[in-house]
Interface confidence: medium
């Protein structure tokens, strides 16, 4: 599923991401935009042999199990395919674990490069939340 901007903002808010670990909803929507272009089925392969999955491009070396990433830790204890569902529950639950891990949203390269220090509130402007 490819979410609309406000549709995703509402779903993320419903799942408790607004101000989770101090990160406003706009940060999460911005991250999803530049990680996956709001596409729940996005997959991208990395040079280390791991793959990123879903709307928040969660990595198979650390967070989920895709059965083929050497040394996978699967810290979210889920199959990576669960992160590709049109229901973003699994992605959100795993993202909460990631953002609580010490580096905050710096774990997402796209957030660091495209969202951090910008007017992230623009990503939820005009949305009825």
């Amino acid at each position: 599923k490819v979410f609309g901007r406000c549709e995703l903002a509402a779903a993320m808010k419903r799942h408790g991401l607004d101000n989770y670990r101090g990160y406003s909803l706009g940060n999460w929507v911005c991250a999803a935009k530049f990680e996956s272009n709001f596409n729940t089925q996005a997959t991208n392969r990395n040079t280390d042999g791991s793959t990123d999955y879903g709307i928040l491009q969660i990595n198979s070396r650390w967070w989920c199990n895709d059965g083929r990433t050497p040394g996978s830790r699967n810290l979210c204890n889920i199959p990576c395919s669960a992160l590709l569902s049109s229901d973003i529950t699994a992605s959100v639950n795993c993202a909460k674990k990631i953002v609580s891990d010490g580096n905050g949203m710096n774990a997402w390269v796209a957030w660091r490069n495209r969202c951090k220090g910008t007017d992230v509130q623009a990503w939820i402007r005009g949305c009825r939340l």
């Epitope: 089925q41 997959t43 040079t47 042999g49 059965g67 083929r68 990433t69 050497p70 395919s81 590709l84």
Partner: antibody
Framework: QVQLQESGAEVMKPGASVKISCKAT????????IEWVKQRPGHGLEWIGE????????YYNEKFKGKATFTADTSSNTAYMQLSSLTSEDSAVYYC?????????WGQGTTLTVS | DIELTQSPATLSVTPGDSVSLSCRAS??????LHWYQQKSHESPRLLIK???QLMSGIPSRFSGSGSGTDFTLSINSVETEDFGMYFC?????????FGGGTKLEIK
């Protein structure tokens, strides 16, 4: 137990298309990548590409882009590979395998003859 | 693409001999190297994954070693059932690639 059952041998004319199937049983089909591998005598094994059935995400070896197309039907736990514009170079045995980085589970192979 | 070169192309041995098969990668692939055995008209069978991890049901006479670019499959005291083709495969990067194979035949 995990099994991958491929469709039977095919004899096709040059220029035609063929669709090979791979039915998976014994595991959660949507969770694992299905890989496709080509084997020609004297050419060893070649990785064609892969599909993640749960999402339809696909990756192709550059060499096979435009030649192979992968699809999957999660209702029947079956992956498909269509090969188009067939030539004699496409005559080979085609295998599906479960993509665990390495390939522990293989189909029995589908022999394609183009002539 | 990572190229895998296997040597020798053919190895003629007598049952009871011990042999080593080589697989060399064109660039470092860490330990992401797997070995397969294939007999005529059969699908490949995974023997060893990640350089040295013997798969369940594979006899202990098979072992693997190496890292980076140079890898070896060893068979300690070859048995008649071991004759066939052996392939290496890397999963360090895409596209996945296989070696050209080593044919193990009876002398």
């Amino acid at each position: 137990q995990v099994q991958l059952q491929e469709s039977g041998a095919e004899v096709m004319k040059p220029g035609a298309s063929v669709k090979i199937s791979c039915k998976a049983t014994g595991y959660t089909f949507t969770t694992y990548w299905i890989e496709w591998v080509k084997q020609r005598p004297g050419h060893g094994l070649e990785w064609i590409g892969e599909i993640l059935p749960g999402s339809g995400s696909t990756y192709y070896n550059e060499k096979f882009k435009g030649k192979a197309t992968f699809t999957a039907d999660t209702s029947s736990n079956t992956a498909y590979m269509q090969l188009s514009s067939l030539t004699s170079e496409d005559s080979a045995v085609y295998y599906c395998a479960r993509g665990d980085g390495n390939y522990y589970y293989w189909g029995q192979g589908t022999t394609l003859t183009v002539s | 693409d990572i190229e895998l070169t296997q040597s020798p192309a053919t190895l003629s041995v007598t049952p009871g001999d011990s042999v080593s098969l080589s697989c060399r990668a064109s660039q470092s692939i860490s330990n992401n190297l797997h070995w397969y055995q294939q007999k005529s008209h059969e699908s490949p069978r995974l023997l060893i994954k990640y350089t040295s991890q013997l798969m369940s049901g594979i006899p202990s006479r098979f072992s693997g070693s190496g890292s980076g670019t140079d890898f070896t499959l060893s068979i300690n005291s070859v048995e008649t059932e071991d004759f066939g083709m052996y392939f290496c495969q890397q999963s360090n990067s895409w596209p996945r690639t296989f070696g050209g194979g080593t044919k193990l035949e009876i002398k």
